[in-house]
Interface confidence: low
């Protein structure tokens, strides 16, 4: 099995990216995007079992806290490590404008 | 109140910097850690509900796409913003060393 | 034993639309697992077109995204792939498989779409 | 998208040949990397996933080894029905990527 990497709770089952496909509606931007019409936003999902993808130290303590003290502390959940950036076309008061966001894709996960 | 900060579900319920009280055994450290034998662990603990403390424009969308899709779609989480470095004494073949640990302690929270 | 075979039209006219579906036996693609669509055009190299999962949830590499659509039949434990607008650049053999955890490990024989009118 | 390169392209070799091909990614992959077996009309097999888990089935002469960007596939021993086209993939950001593929022949 894999240190750290192999999801012990079967297949496709732990932090992992996945590609949600939304409307400018869905996101609510359809007063403010003019394009894309459409989106695919890729966001981390899944669980993070004991010591999947751990971010760092912070992670690999909040994974012993909650098997101790599952009620008090949660465990590490899965979020972006990086993103990719999206350049969106915008309506402005004189027209249009393209603005790129870095924070809006997700690129690869982990968890913390 | 602010906004993005105020928790609608009531005070202390939204996602907020805690502090856990553990010790060496508790995080498994026992063996390679001399000191301190307590450590108090802060960590981000409380939901994420609509906008609250979003850390970036995936925080909002991921928001978004909660309320049209709760089954696939995730709330944000609440995960650290910073960190706070942390001395530890370890345990080497010779004796001791000094380490310091960057990604240890949570020092502010957000939601992702 | 996993099997997923491939079927559909293996003649495709330019701009029209193709369609594809994969049959699987031996596993429920209503389980975890990842049903993917792959293509190699003719002497090149393969091609990650997307995947549907359990949940719902879809993806469908950037450079294709516009045109294609992944469903699920549940029913008949199918998959399907629809790319739309085709033009000669999309003859290809289009696989389908199986991602488990993160690898393919189980993949249909091909099949051969050539678009031409 | 994350680029693979794999090298050779092809490869003549004898049977009981150890033989050696590699996969460069074009940016840390954390050892997802996965190694498949084609042959002509038949289904594509896996051989190795994880960089050097051998998947249920495949004969132990075939290893994988790597990190980061480089990663290799090694058969010991060359039998007959390893004469094949053999190809890597990245697992590790979407969407996932192949290297061109490497056809081992008889020489």
């Known amino acids: 099995a894999r240190n750290g990497d192999h999801c012990p709770l079967g297949p496709g089952r732990c932090c992992r990216l996945h590609t949600v496909r939304a409307s400018l509606e869905d996101l609510g931007w359809a007063d403010w995007v003019l394009s894309p019409r459409e989106v695919q936003v890729t966001m981390c999902i899944g669980a993070c079992p004991s010591q999947f993808r751990a971010a760092n130290m912070h992670a690999q303590i909040k994974t012993s806290l909650h098997r101790l003290k599952p009620d008090t502390v949660p465990a590490p959940c899965c979020v972006p490590a990086s993103y990719n950036p999206m350049v969106l076309i915008q309506k402005t008061d004189t027209g249009v404008s393209l603005q790129t966001y870095d924070d809006l894709l997700a690129k690869d996960c982990h968890c913390i | 109140a602010r906004n993005g900060d105020h928790c609608p579900l009531g005070p202390g319920r939204c996602c907020r910097l805690h502090t856990v009280r553990a010790s060496l055994e508790d995080l498994g450290w026992a063996d390679w850690v001399l000191s301190p034998r307590e450590v108090q662990v802060t960590m981000c603990i409380g939901a994420c509900p609509s906008q609250f403390r979003a850390a970036n424009m995936h925080a909002q969308i991921k928001t978004s796409l909660h309320r049209l899709k709760p089954d696939t779609v995730p709330a944000p989480c609440c995960v650290p913003a910073s960190y706070n470095p942390m001395v530890l004494i370890q345990k080497t073949d010779t004796g001791v060393s000094l380490q310091t640990y960057d990604d240890l302690l949570a020092k502010d929270c957000h939601c992702i | 034993q996993v099997q997923l075979q491939e079927s559909g039209p293996g003649l495709v006219k330019p701009s029209e639309t193709l369609s594809l579906t994969c049959t699987v036996s031996?596993?429920?693609?209503?389980?975890?697992?990842?049903w993917i669509w792959i293509r190699q055009p003719p002497g090149k190299g393969l091609e990650y077109i997307g995947y549907?999962?359990?949940?719902?949830?879809?993806y469908y590499n950037p450079s294709l995204a516009s045109r294609t659509t992944i469903s699920r039949d549940t029913s008949k434990n199918q998959f399907s792939l629809k790319l739309s607008s085709v033009t000669a650049a999309d003859t290809a053999v289009y696989y389908c498989?199986?991602?488990?955890?993160?690898?393919?490990?189980?993949w249909g024989q091909g099949t051969l779409v050539t678009v031409s009118s | 998208d994350i680029q693979m390169t794999q090298s050779p392209s092809s490869l003549s070799a004898s049977v009981g040949d150890r033989v050696t091909i590699t996969c460069r990614a074009s940016?840390?992959?954390?050892?997802?990397l996965n190694w498949y077996q084609q042959k002509p009309g038949k289904a594509v097999k896996l051989l190795i996933h994880?960089?050097?888990t051998l998947h249920s089935g495949v004969p132990s002469r075939f290893s994988g080894s790597g990190s980061g960007t480089d990663y290799t596939l090694t058969i010991s021993s060359l039998q007959p029905e390893d004469f094949a086209t053999y190809f890597c993939?990245?697992?590790?950001?979407?969407?996932?990527?192949f290297g061109q593929g490497t056809k081992l022949e008889i020489k």
């Open positions: 993939q990245q697992g590790n950001t979407l969407p996932w990527t």
């Open positions: 498989a199986r991602d488990c955890d993160y690898a393919m490990d189980y």
């Open positions: 031996g596993f429920s693609i209503n389980r975890d697992c990842y």
């Open positions: 940016q840390d992959i954390s050892n997802y």
């Open positions: 994880y960089t050097s």
């Open positions: 549907t999962f359990y949940s719902g949830i879809t």
